[in-house]
């Protein structure tokens, strides 16, 4: 059988503004023209969808308007950015890649990226 491999970094630290970016790269067993990329979060053994986008190879990645994710694609590499993160969102974020068209369908799962989010300290009152 032909296997599909998805690679993503093990750890990412979100910025002080609650933005985290990482690359999701996949080794495709076929020549897909339509690809779906989903970011999932695992918490308490439950895996839930954070955001998803379908794109045609060679075109831009498009998330829904209200999505907290943005991204760009280049060949078999997707650059993902998650915004609006807070400390409580710290966790394991999994990249899922599906080769939708043409058949056969493939699904690949990354090992997950542990994203650490630290809420910024409030600015102290100044005595001016």
């Amino acid at each position: 059988c032909k296997a599909m491999h998805v690679a993503q970094p093990a750890v990412v630290l979100a910025s002080s503004r609650g933005i985290a970016s990482f690359v999701c790269e996949y080794a495709s067993p076929g020549k897909a023209t339509e690809v779906r990329v989903t970011v999932l979060r695992q918490a308490d053994s439950q895996v839930t969808e954070v955001c998803a986008a379908t794109y045609m190879m060679g075109n831009e990645l498009t998330f829904l308007d209200d999505s907290i994710c943005t991204g760009t694609s280049s060949g078999n590499q997707v650059n993902l950015t998650i915004q609006g993160l807070r400390a409580m969102d710290t966790g394991l974020y999994i990249c899922k890649v599906e080769l939708m068209y043409p058949p056969p369908y493939y699904l690949g799962i990354g090992n997950g990226t542990q994203i650490y989010v630290i809420d910024p300290e409030p600015c102290p009152d100044s005595d001016f």
């Epitope: 059988c1 599909m4 999932l40 695992q42 999994i94 493939y106 690949g108 799962i109 090992n111």
Partner: nanobody
Framework: EVQLVESGGGLVQPGGSLRLSCAAS????????MGWFRQAPGKGREEVSS???????FYTDSVKGRFTISRDNAKNTLYLQMNSLRPEDTAVYYC?????????WGQGTLVTVSS
Amino acid sequence: EVQLVESGGGLVQPGGSLRLSCAASGFSPSVNYMGWFRQAPGKGREEVSSIYPTGGTFYTDSVKGRFTISRDNAKNTLYLQMNSLRPEDTAVYYCAAGKYGTDYWGQGTLVTVSS
């Protein structure tokens, strides 16, 4: 070579239940992913529920609270308990497995939800 054989499909009335089984043979320790997919006529394949290599459990939104996935490692069998079935659950259900995704597929079992 890993082989997957599904069973348990059939005709059921709306609101009814079915339990699908997927028996795996030639199993490899490197199989970390097992999941259930479905394909309705004229539609693409959809991941319904899976056990991920990270140990987490995934359910697509439309089946949350109705379907339960489980795995019996001693029997090398994956199950999908489907309750409160709806007509829109009608599809061929496939079992898939692999190291990090769908390396192997079963032949599928048909689930029809109709009164």
